[in-house]
């Protein structure tokens, strides 16, 4: 069992075309975080936040991924294909690696929801 714990936003849902914030938080440890990796369900890297080098967004996601807030990640222009698991990996010393999981479900905007937004009371 590791010293610290990872808290995540857990299971979240967002609408197609919208955006969502993925957040992880490492607590209960004095270890220093040197890097946070954000991975998609197929284990492809979305982005890296390195303590020395800052943010790096991988080219395939540059148009739809924004760094932050904090060590989190914002996914934009969501599609149904974005549904699935996302992982934050905290590389720390001397504790080693902490891993958090978030499940994102992207929902179709239903006709009812769409029309309700424009409903006149």
């Amino acid at each position: 069992m590791m010293t610290g714990t990872i808290e995540t936003t857990g299971n979240i849902s967002a609408k197609k075309g919208g955006s969502v914030i993925l957040q992880c938080h490492l607590s209960s440890t004095m270890a220093q975080v040197t890097q946070v990796n954000w991975e998609q369900h197929d284990h492809s890297l979305l982005a890296i936040r390195n303590a020395e080098l800052g943010w790096h967004i991988y080219p395939a996601f540059k148009d739809r991924v924004a760094p932050g807030p904090g060590l989190g990640l914002t996914l934009q222009s969501l599609t149904m294909n974005d549904t699935g698991e996302y992982f934050c990996t905290y590389h720390t010393y001397p504790d080693g690696t902490y891993r958090g999981r978030i499940f994102l479900e992207v929902l179709e905007s239903s006709v009812a929801e769409h029309s309700a937004r424009f409903q006149i009371p």
Epitope: M1, M2, T3, M30, Q32, T34, Q35, N37, N50, A51, E52, L53, T89, H91, Y93, P94, D95, G96, T97
Partner: antibody, heavy 122, light 107 residues
Framework: QLQLQESGPGLVKPAETLSLTCTVS??????????WTWIRQPPGKGLEWIGT???????FHNPSLKSRVTIPVDTSKNQFSLKLSSVTAADTAVYYC??????????????WGQGTLVTVSS | DIQMTQSPSSLSASVGDRVTITCRAS??????LNWYQQKPGKAPKLLIY???SLQSGVPSRFSGSGSGTDFTLTISSLQPEDFATYYC?????????FGGGTKVEIK
């Protein structure tokens, strides 16, 4: 098979800077999962942790060595180094470089170089 | 800093003996305790990590136990190649610290 090899002068004059390099082969120093370390052992004595570095340059060092230690990284050469300033005879030791791994909680030092003896003397 | 105290500092034993080395931490380090073997003129070699996990390639006669502050390295049946110095090391927090070593000599 991962290998680490220390290199540098075996004799350093007092008050000068000790400089050693560790060359890593059989693996990448830029691995996100590993940290890289310097450890020393004075003749006939025990082991002392000097400091640890991540590929990007984040460093952790032993407060007992105050601010005398820097651990630069050169990812293009797959190397990391040790620079210890203002040396005295007490810094005479065998210096080892090592990898922090495997990818487990609070990892140990799993691969070591063979060590290089550095003597501080005028 | 966490102090690591090993005992005994040296011991004499015969081939086939069961050997026990202890390591005590000055505060709780959970199970983040590692054991190394060092032979003269050679680099230390990792034997046990996380108190009881055997490093790949290390003979099963080596075992580790303990948690908190008290840890033990046991060699169930000492072999000629086991005569060496053994060090414990905590990886719980920085600065990383080692025990003073236990030299296992031939009786």
């Amino acid at each position: 098979q991962l290998q680490l090899q220390e290199s540098g002068p075996g004799l350093v004059k007092p008050a000068e800077t000790l400089s050693l390099t560790c060359t890593v082969s059989g693996g990448s120093i830029s691995s996100y999962d590993h940290y890289w370390t310097w450890i020393r052992q004075p003749p006939g004595k025990g082991l002392e942790w000097i400091g640890t570095v991540y590929y990007s340059g984040s460093t952790f060092h032993n407060p007992s060595l105050k601010s005398r230690v820097t651990i630069p990284v050169d990812t293009s050469k797959n190397q990391f180094s040790l620079k210890l300033s203002s040396v005295t005879a007490a810094d005479t030791a065998v210096y080892y470089c090592a990898r922090v791994g495997p990818d487990v909680s609070h990892p140990p030092f799993d691969y070591w170089g063979q060590g290089t003896l550095v003597t501080v003397s005028s | 800093d966490i102090q690591m105290t090993q005992s005994p500092s040296s011991l004499s034993a015969s081939v086939g003996d069961r050997v026990t080395i202890t390591c005590r931490a000055s505060q709780s380090i959970s199970s983040y305790l590692n054991w190394y073997q060092q032979k003269p003129g050679k680099a230390p070699k990792l034997l046990i990590y996380a108190a009881s996990s055997l490093q790949s390639g290390v003979p099963s006669r080596f075992s580790g136990s303990g948690s908190g502050t008290d840890f033990t390295l046991t060699i169930s049946s000492l072999q000629p190649e086991d005569f060496a110095t053994y060090y414990c090391q905590q990886s719980y927090s920085t600065p990383i610290t080692f025990g003073g070593g236990t030299k296992v000599e031939i009786k």
